[in-house]
């Protein structure tokens, strides 16, 4: 059974992930450039189901594409380079989902824009945090 300290650690990691994802979303929403149109044509894959930490596998698999899209922006809206930002997120995701069991991500048939993709994972973080508090 999870201890209160491990629950607290998980909560803090999720809050950190949530803040990173929100920061990216805010950066995109404040971004005014013709490249935004190109960013929005990039398709992201969404999880069929995202209710448990193991489902973060689906986010992990889309982090490289996310980095590529953020590289397009070359924006001052992010205080970190996309590579560093995504690397930070990747570390958190790996710790949260754990590496004991290999989970095969199942994707939904419908693709999403970067905005829809970020909103989906923000909602996921908020939902898990709410179950921990």
């Amino acid at each position: 059974a999870p201890t209160s300290s491990s629950t607290k650690k998980t909560q803090l990691q999720l809050e950190h992930l949530l803040l990173d994802l929100q920061m990216i979303l805010n950066g995109i929403n404040n971004y005014k450039n013709p490249k935004l149109t190109r960013m929005l044509t990039f398709k992201f894959y969404m999880p069929k189901k995202a209710t448990e930490l193991k489902h973060l596998q689906c986010l992990e698999e889309e982090l490289k594409p996310l980095e590529e899209v953020l590289n397009l922006a070359q924006s001052k809206n992010f205080h970190l380079r996309p590579r560093d930002l995504i690397s930070n997120i990747n570390v958190i995701v790996l710790e949260l989902k754990g590496s004991e069991t290999t989970f095969m991500c199942e994707y939904a048939d419908e693709t999403a824009t970067i905005v829809e993709f970020l909103n989906r994972w923000i909602t996921f973080c908020q939902s898990i945090i709410s179950t921990l508090t």
């Epitope: 044509t41 990039f42 398709k43 894959y45 698999e61 490289k64 594409p65 980095e67 590529e68 899209v69 590289n71 397009l72 994707y107 048939d109 419908e110 693709t111």
Partner: antibody
């Protein structure tokens, strides 16, 4: 200018594995955001997407072919490959490799290679 | 899978004619619709992406419109090099699927 070139046998026997390679020239297969696809066209018919690979090795396949398809990448050779197992006559088609950005439109295509499945 | 239905399947037209090809998706695909031109023995070539955006180098006589389920490719003044088969393709759902094609022939 990026160019794609398919290569591989034009004749494959039924039940065997079809193997094709696509060589990318004029650019790096590791270019960010680009996906490397296989698409086929049956004689006199429409186009069917088979699947893609990203330079990192991530793949996604058409569910209708998933059980028989493997796409791999060799970044050192700037190539990606298609393997289609247990082929039947209905797999006879022109096979194209194609590039897309962000899983969207296929902007660059190889010239295509005709593969016939026959004993 | 999303079904893409093109109409007509073939048409005859003369040089200078205005030609319209339609594509209907079995479900809404937002504006994630691409158009290709294919000539005999050649690979397809993208003309329009995201329903109405021009691929660089494509003549301005080609234009695309539509969103949701109904889309149109228009050639404002048909040129001799435009006689070919045209395909629509959706990129909103997995797997990506193509229409069956519309062959544009000389009248």
């Amino acid at each position: 200018q990026v160019q794609l070139q398919e290569s591989g046998p034009g004749l494959v026997k039924p039940s065997q594995t079809l193997s094709l390679t696509c060589t990318v020239s004029g650019g790096s297969i590791s270019s960010g955001g680009y996906y490397w696809n296989w698409i086929r066209q049956h004689p006199g018919k429409g186009l069917e997407w088979i699947g893609y690979i990203y330079y990192s090795g991530n793949t996604h396949y058409n569910p209708s072919l998933k059980s028989r398809v493997t796409i791999s990448v060799d970044t050192s050779k700037n190539q990606f490959s298609l393997k289609l197992s247990s082929v039947i006559a209905a797999d006879t088609a022109v096979y194209y490799c194609a590039r897309d950005w962000g899983r969207d439109a296929f902007d660059i295509w190889g010239q295509g290679t005709m593969v016939t499945v026959s004993s | 899978d999303i079904q893409m239905t093109q109409s007509p399947s073939s048409l005859s037209a003369s040089v200078g004619d205005r030609v319209t090809i339609t594509c209907r998706a079995s479900q809404t695909i937002s504006s994630y619709l691409n158009w290709y031109q294919q000539k005999p023995g050649k690979a397809p070539k993208v003309l329009i992406y995201a329903a109405s955006s021009f691929q660089s180098g494509v003549p301005s006589r080609f234009s695309g419109s539509g969103s949701g389920t109904d889309f149109t490719l228009t050639i404002s003044s048909l040129q001799p090099e435009d006689f070919a088969t045209y395909y629509c393709q959706q990129s909103h759902y997995i797997p990506r699927t193509f229409g069956q094609g519309t062959k544009v022939e000389i009248k």
